[in-house]
């Protein structure tokens, strides 16, 4: 199955643009509870040189702070390295760039290892369509349905998205 592996225009760049967080999951519930380190929300993404740059919204003191992060490519095509509250192996588990994206992270912080998954969509009005896919990916990586938190508009910094 040889092929042209040079990424063409419209390759990883298809992930660029606005995204909306829909659901989070973790084996450590404190991480995704309000004020948890991983209760963060995607605002937008861009791709350059095979790396993913994300603007995320972090709730802080009743407001939302926008922070820029970069996930660096690795030798494995769907795996990226991200430094955020320790080291994260970030995996893009299931992707449709025009519709939804499911990622999960293996986080290592102070000798503690955690698993966090994130569902994001392009169009919030279709968020229910992709929850079954998220539940399925969570199941595949060992997270149960009761470890999933579906976000509401109030949760995800909707007022801070401009």
């Amino acid at each position: 199955q040889e092929g042209n592996h040079e990424e063409p225009q419209g390759g990883l760049e298809e992930l660029s643009g606005r995204w909306h967080s829909v659901a989070l999951a973790s084996n450590k519930s404190d991480l995704i509870k309000p004020w948890g380190h991983f209760r963060v929300f995607i605002h937008s993404m861009s791709a350059k040189d095979g790396n993913l740059h994300g603007d995320i919204l972090i709730p802080q003191d009743g407001q939302c702070e926008k922070v820029s992060l970069t996930a660096f490519k690795t030798a494995t095509s769907n795996k990226f390295d991200l430094e955020y509250w320790g080291h994260n192996d970030l995996y893009l588990a299931e992707v449709d760039p025009k519709s939804y994206l499911i990622l999960y992270m293996i986080n290592q912080y102070n000798d503690d290892t955690s698993l966090v998954a994130h569902l994001m969509v392009r169009d919030l009005s279709r968020q229910q369509d992709f929850l079954p896919a998220f539940e399925s990916v969570c199941e595949d990586i060992g997270l149960h349905k009761d470890q999933i938190v579906v976000l509401s508009d109030d949760d995800r910094c909707q007022g801070s998205r401009d």
Epitope: H5, E7, L12, S99
Partner: nanobody, 125 residues
């Protein structure tokens, strides 16, 4: 084990049309991509078009955009490639492929796990 069978190839005049079909049998993934790739003699296999089973999202190589259309029938596990305004440079063996919605399925062959045997398309001038 998934099996993919292509059909519909053949010889056609330039500016003509063909419809390729790919039938998948066996156990597929929950959500998957089906793609078409092609390989001309002496060239590398290249992406042509792909579609997601759950969303119907489609992607095309720049060289075929506006001329080719990919469509799916999930109930029958088939994907068709409608090829119009064919050019001699479209001559190649066309392969159908199936895989999960891994990063890159919309432009790259690597995310695909299963491949058909290919069907020859020849466009004469």
């Amino acid at each position: 084990e998934v099996q993919l069978v292509e059909s519909g190839g053949g010889l056609v005049q330039a500016r003509g049309s063909l419809r390729l079909s790919c039938a998948a049998s066996g156990r597929t993934f929950n959500n998957y991509a089906m793609g078409w790739f092609r390989q001309a003699p002496g060239k590398e296999r290249e992406f042509v078009a792909a579609i997601a089973s759950n969303t119907g999202t489609t992607y095309y190589a720049g060289s075929v955009k506006g001329r080719f259309a990919i469509s799916r029938d999930n109930a029958k596990n088939t994907v068709d490639l409608h090829m119009n305004s064919l050019k001699p440079e479209d001559t190649a063996v066309y392969y159908c492929a199936l895989g999960p919605l891994r990063l890159g399925w919309w432009y790259d062959s690597r995310p695909y796990d299963y491949w058909g045997q290919g069907t020859q398309v020849t466009v004469s001038s």
